[in-house]
């Protein structure tokens, strides 16, 4: 029999609003095992996937998605799913991203850095919708 | 190489259950949705249905109760169930862009089915 | 379930010429959008997706624009090996699912 798979988290560091021009990443996180985890924008077409894959902790495996200089066009909704064969996931909930225009240096953001979720996540509507990852170093320019 | 390709296609009699495989070859199948379209002699393309990476299957709303579309690891398959002759066409499966679901640029040269008494 | 109503079916042009093609979605669609191009005997090869990006190989003679209801293919400078039959396709999976139907095509000859 199959095991249930948990579905996955999805944080952004430093923070979820982010000023134009820095940077910012999502971390995906599941469970030990994952062999690929996909980065999805709502109403969007794109994705990002990657198999670069780290262990986060003996119980939880973690994929990180990179954008450099955060554009206006970067701001909305984000969600993870992970490929554990078999089978895939059920979607993250929605993470959102906030850009905003940037009063200090591309080093000053608002957010405190490890924030994440808060209330910029919302449930994903996962009715229909199944179509984005991660590691450190890999770019997110299908997101774009 | 990267390609799919279309197989299980011939003359059957009305009725007759039909089942067309779509094979995967040079990628990872589970990442990719893949498509079913048809193009009856001398018609426009109509889609047909399609089997997506996480496991979702959909179906044009005339295709419902006709066709049954599965997957396995290296296959797609479309199963029609009670054909007629309305549905002797050429059978096309298809993978979306890497990055991309809006568009399907890997396509199989497609097989022919005949539906005849 | 969603229709694409593609126009104009068919449409003559001069080599080096440039030929509009349009489609509009019954429903929005945002930019999950496709257009092919098929060859008589030939399986359909992708020419834009995303409703205005260019396919791998396209030259960019070959343009996507619009979004939402409203799309438009146009093939500027026009060559012989040009014709063929376009296609417009909904890929939409979205919130809701919308089917995957295409346009009825547009017949391009050149002159």
């Known amino acids: 029999q199959e095991e249930d798979l948990p579905r996955p988290s999805i944080s952004a560091e430093p923070g979820t609003v982010i000023p134009l021009g820095s940077h910012v990443t999502f971390v995906c996180r599941g469970p030990v095992g994952v062999q690929t985890f996909r980065l999805e924008r709502d109403s969007r077409s794109t994705y990002n996937d990657t198999e670069d894959v780290s262990q986060a902790s003996p119980s939880e495996s973690e994929a990180r998605f990179r954008i450099d200089s955060v554009r206006e066009g970067n701001a909305g909704l984000y969600r993870c799913i992970y490929y554990k064969p078999p089978k895939w996931s059920e979607q993250s909930d929605y993470l959102e991203l906030l850009v905003k225009e940037s009063s200090g240096g591309p080093d000053s953001p608002d957010t405190e850095p490890g924030s994440s979720a808060g209330p910029t996540q919302r449930p994903s509507d996962n009715s229909h919708n199944e179509h984005a990852p991660a590691s450190q170093g890999l770019k997110a320019e299908h997101l774009y | 190489e990267q390609s799919v390709e279309e197989s299980g296609g011939r003359l059957v009699t009305p009725g007759t259950p039909l089942t067309l495989t779509c094979t995967a070859s040079?990628?990872?199948?589970?990442?990719?949705?893949i498509q079913w379209v048809r193009q009856a002699p001398g018609k426009g393309l109509e889609y047909i249905g399609a089997s997506t990476y996480a496991g979702y299957t959909y179906y044009a709303s005339w295709a419902i109760g006709r066709v049954t579309i599965s997957r396995t690891s290296t296959t797609v398959d479309l199963k029609m169930t009670s054909p007629t002759t309305e549905d002797t066409a050429t059978y096309f499966c298809?993978?979306?862009?890497?990055?991309?679901?809006?568009?399907?640029?890997?396509w199989g040269p497609g097989t022919l089915v005949t539906i005849s008494s | 379930e969603l229709d694409l109503t593609q126009t104009p079916a068919s449409v003559s042009a001069a080599v080096g010429g440039t030929v509009t093609i349009k489609c509009q979605a019954s429903q929005s669609i945002d930019t999950w959008f496709g257009w092919y191009q098929q060859k008589p005997g030939q399986s359909p090869k992708l020419l834009i997706y995303?409703?205005?990006k260019l396919a791998s190989g396209v030259p960019p003679r070959f343009k996507g624009s619009g979004s939402g209801t409203e799309f438009t293919l146009t093939i500027s400078d026009l060559e012989c090996a040009d014709a063929a039959t376009y296609y417009c396709?909904?890929?939409?999976?979205?919130?809701?699912?919308?089917?995957?139907?295409f346009g009825g095509g547009t017949e391009v000859e050149i002159k």
């Open positions: 298809a993978r979306h862009i890497d990055g991309d679901y809006s568009g399907y640029a890997l």
């Open positions: 995303g409703a205005s």
């Open positions: 396709q909904n890929t939409y999976y979205g919130v809701r699912y919308l089917g995957g139907a």
């Open positions: 040079g990628f990872s199948l589970y990442k990719y949705n």
